[in-house]
Amino acid sequence: AFGISGVQKYTRALHDSSITGISPITEYLASLSTYNDQSITFALEDESYEIYVEDLKKDEKKDKVLLSYYESQHPSNESGDGVDGKMLMVTLSPTKDFWLHANNKEHSVELHKCEKPLPDQAFFVLHNMHSNCVSFECKTDPGVFIGVKDNHLALIKVDSSENLCTENILFKLSET
């Protein structure tokens, strides 16, 4: 649908996008689950956090994640002022001082302890190609999304806009 190399054009200038404020415009505490209703859980093991994708037992409490929404200006190749519009970027924090990070070298998603200002690896561009599902695209690597691979979170390359609807990069947010 997009002509030039799918997602690369679709998200052409993420590297150049700048977050317009150091404060989030809103924050949202939610549990994170896959398109197939498996829960994303976080466990402290050997002084570091592990991330799991698993079926929860009945009545087992879901882990919550704090999603912080930031606005980011998007450079334009069309509009005269050089700014086409705004994107929403999110950071995801399951516990105080820990944030999800994209490790592009290892194609992995990791929890890192860090202080603000957060590094670019902690920011993900928010997409929703379904009304009730979201996807998270790496700010540092356009066209690469958080996805599910072998019951773990991983970074998955999406090579065309049609594949933005692929189930393994779709996540559901819920308050319960």
């Epitope: 939610a30 606005e71 509009s79 086409d84 519009g85 009304s131 009730n132 609807c165 308050e175």
Partner: antibody
Framework: EVQLVETGGGLVQPGRSLKLSCKTS????????MYWIRQAPGKGLEWVSS????????YYPDSVKGRFTISRDNAENTIYLQMSSLRSEDTATYFC??????????????WGQGSLVTVSS | EIQMTQSPSVLSASVGDRVTLSCKAS??????LDWYQQKLGEAPKLLIY???NLQTGIPSRFSGSGSGTDCTLTINSLQPGDVATYFC????????FGGGTKLELD
């Protein structure tokens, strides 16, 4: 400058069909959710349809589901609303709107001026 | 489907007044709420997004607040140009408008 211009409205008999167009300019059309919203004379706003940036998913309220179809042409920067089996209660001004943010269905950042559809015999 | 209820449906106020408009959702909408202003014969215009963020170019006398199911639009020091109908809009689950509040001058 962002512009959205609706065309195709007019007088139509009950049970007949009509197709609205919304031609846009001034933004990267293929990266935005797009919407149709309507307003009956003297009444409030009613969401009518939404479409994702790549056109792969479309959404409707029960009041128009099965009768209205939203579509888009990303090469022409245009969205459409095909309305069939029209009823008198579909009489309204139809606005197209663009999402406020790239890639997400949050907020209606810009609206067109609207196109009046009158369903009457 | 989430229902959005605005009150009052009509509000009369004087220039300089502080005006408060209410919007109540039938379930938690997680601050996924906008306010739109529609003047007579015009298209609606985005004023406030994500409950409390002012859209570029909108005067600072407009502000939004709230969480959960209850949200409020406040206009500090009402101006003649603020006469309009104001609609709330949720996008937490589907898309729904409130019925609107028509703001008039005394």
């Amino acid at each position: 400058e962002v512009q959205l211009v609706e065309t195709g409205g007019g007088l139509v008999q009950p049970g007949r069909s009509l197709k609205l167009s919304c031609k846009t300019s001034g933004f990267t059309f293929s990266s935005y959710w797009m919407y149709w919203i309507r307003q009956a004379p003297g009444k409030g706003l009613e969401w009518v349809s939404s479409i994702t940036p790549n056109g792969g998913n479309t959404y409707y309220p029960d009041s128009v589901k099965g009768r209205f179809t939203i579509s888009r042409d990303n090469a022409e920067n245009t969205i459409y609303l095909q309305m069939s089996s029209l009823r008198s209660e579909d009489t309204a001004t139809y606005f197209c709107a663009k999402g406020h943010y790239y890639y997400t269905s949050y907020s209606l950042g810009y609206w067109g001026q609207g196109s009046l559809v009158t369903v009457s015999s | 489907e989430i229902q959005m209820t605005q009150s009052p449906s009509v509000l009369s106020a004087s220039v300089g007044d502080r005006v408060t408009l209410s919007c109540k959702a039938s379930q938690n909408i997680n601050k996924h709420l906008d306010w739109y202003q529609q003047k007579l014969g015009e298209a609606p215009k985005l004023l406030i997004y994500f409950t409390n963020n002012l859209q570029t170019g909108i005067p600072s006398r407009f502000s939004g607040s709230g969480s959960g199911t209850d949200c409020t639009l406040t206009i500090n020091s009402l101006q003649p140009g603020d006469v309009a109908t104001y609609f709330c809009f949720q996008y937490n689950n589907g898309w729904t408008f409130g019925g609107g509040t028509k703001l008039e001058l005394d």
